[in-house]
Amino acid sequence: QPPPPPPDATCHQVRSFFQRLQPGLKWVPETPVPGSDLQVCLPKGPTCCSRKMEEKYQLTARLNMEQLLQSASMELKFLIIQNAAVFQEAFEIVVRHAKNYTNAMFKNNYPSLTPQAFEFVGEFFTDVSLYILGSDINVDDMVNELFDSLFPVIYTQLMNPGLPDSALDINECLRGARRDLKVFGNFPKLIMTQVSKSLQVTRIFLQALNLGIEVINTTDHLKFSKDCGRMLTRMWYCSYCQGLMMVKPCGGYCNVVMQGCMAGVVEIDKYWREYILSLEELVNGMYRIYDMENVLLGLFSTIHDSIQYVQKNAGKLTTTIGKLCAHSQQRQYR
Amino acid sequence: SAYYPEDLFIDKKVLKVAHVEHEETLSSRRRELIQKLKSFISFYSALPGYICSHSPVAENDTLCWNGQELVERYSQKAARNGMKNQFNLHELKMKGPEPVVSQIIDKLKHINQLLRTMSVPKGRVLDKNLDEEGFESGDCGDDEDECIGGSGDGMMKVKNQLRFLAELAYDLDVDDVPGNNQQATPKDNEISTFHN
């Protein structure tokens, strides 16, 4: 093994390098010293390092490591952050268009139901947005509410338009009758199934992307231990103490040190792999009734069909409801 | 059938109803994201190697530093000697992950569980139990998808035809990462960038 080159007799090189790290220099010895107080860069002979310099090197080493880690994850972080934002906005656009489609369907096919229908449709799609963003709303409740609200308007405006104003008191009775008589057939249930499946998948997709950001942010801002700081210092800076400014760490040695410093972070690997593969599986299944774009943009048509179903059975329904709600002002409908 | 004229759109610039074959759709964008994410599947296991390759390491030099002394790059001492009589590397590994890392692992386990639960098994996209109560007068078939947009002729086809790039102010090209131009080339697209 070749002998190490003699250390800089004046510590001049070490001083000029250290000055870049810590302007103001009172810590670099003029000439090599025994260095008995050193704890990391343990000297085999005279050294150009002091205890204070060692502390500064440790701090710098840990900072370097943090920067390396942040730059390592920059592309990945950018990818997930930007996609999370894009998908969230895209989903909101889908919801907005689904609402527009549905409102236009009412305006063109059932103008007498507006503006009440617009209000109910608006509330329904607001709930859809809230659900996608993680609010605790039950989809079945949302759909039931839409049909509960629509039926009294459909009944009083389309099926029985001659009702006097005082008969509007029957709205509560009509809400109850809507469910008991299944006036919309199986359409509410159909919509519940389609909407809940597509929205659940959409919501978990967004949640997963946001967690991806959280994972990267967590590992991005890890504070490395003192032990790790000492290892990094020994690898990156202790050679300077011997005046070996241009020497680089051995590759194998670097890998061993990094694996030591990163032991905790690397434990994420297994779950990270699983995360990406599970997300892929989810995405592969996001079509037809599991695709919110497909489901929501087709809702106006299903709602239209459900109203047609009511109209088709209007005669039978009007008779039944007439009997059922005749005395709704005197008694409570249950 | 549900009459739906185009002139009712509030922001037509976003929603193109025309059947454009290669339009960007949400599903294509999702698949594109997954492909990009898969190139980062080994991100965490590759980190130690990545950091070594992006920090000063002896590559072409004959001699290198092993933490204690100058040694020949291919000697046994290149990896080992620097570790002797110093704090125990094994101990460092045995400490286990930091609490924040343990927390994030728990969250990952939870989301992975949810993702697996939500994933649609192949060949079972349609739930047959929907019609347990039966539709009257044949409103929909067994396949509940038939009910989507089942309003007959002239019904606007709305399957995956939103053009989001028109409205979204984002461009997903990763080349546009601020400051990416002065950074190192990614290794195997695994992880990129750093300072020296």
Partner: antibody
Framework: QVQLQESGGGLVQPGRSLRLSCAAS????????MHWVRQAPGKGLEWVSA????????YYADSVEGRFTISRDNSKNTLYLQMNSLRAEDTAVYYC??????????????WGQGTLVTVSS | QSALTQPPSASGSPGQSVTISCTGT?????????VSWYQQYPGKAPKLLIY???NRPSGVPDRFSGSKSGTSASLAITGLQAEDGADYYC??????????FGGGTKVTVLG
Amino acid sequence: QVQLQESGGGLVQPGRSLRLSCAASGFTFSSYAMHWVRQAPGKGLEWVSAISSSGRSTYYADSVEGRFTISRDNSKNTLYLQMNSLRAEDTAVYYCAKDRRGSHADALNVWGQGTLVTVSS
Amino acid sequence: QSALTQPPSASGSPGQSVTISCTGTSSDVGGYNYVSWYQQYPGKAPKLLIYGNSNRPSGVPDRFSGSKSGTSASLAITGLQAEDGADYYCQSYDSSLRVVFGGGTKVTVLG
């Protein structure tokens, strides 16, 4: 006519439990979200809890989370609030209120007259 | 969850106008969420005045109007009358769908 009638209030010692009930009439109870709101003497309104029309979703204020439980029986048109581990600061008039929406909280368009709960040793 | 911010008091002479503000955050008033306003007389249950930011339930005089902009909402009472002297509360819900009330504003009709 739409009505809500609370019952079950009274004097109770700290740490003990109490169950409030609210009987609803004049509307389709199973179609609407329901709430409990309280008002301490001389103070403003403080929302306590809500439940969706089906009872599948429940919501609580931070101050009562884990101690109070809201529930409903749609077949009996009745709303309940089970209050455990009561504290002096839970002393208030408790109002039962009907929401104008069914799936979640929005606007409370019908209120009961309130029942007084006093927590004191 | 924190309460919405309202001024503790407001006053005006009969026939004048009074506006009460209600300030929240992006997760309640500023989100998708709607603002409601209530009127309460001493010893009585509150009564809904405005829902969905600006809608009046039937029976509420059109002297009462509501509006919302960003994270703030306001209730305007025009042509103030003696019976308008009461406590007024704004209310919204946060992103977790939990209801949040304002601290209340006492409106005094002078003279």
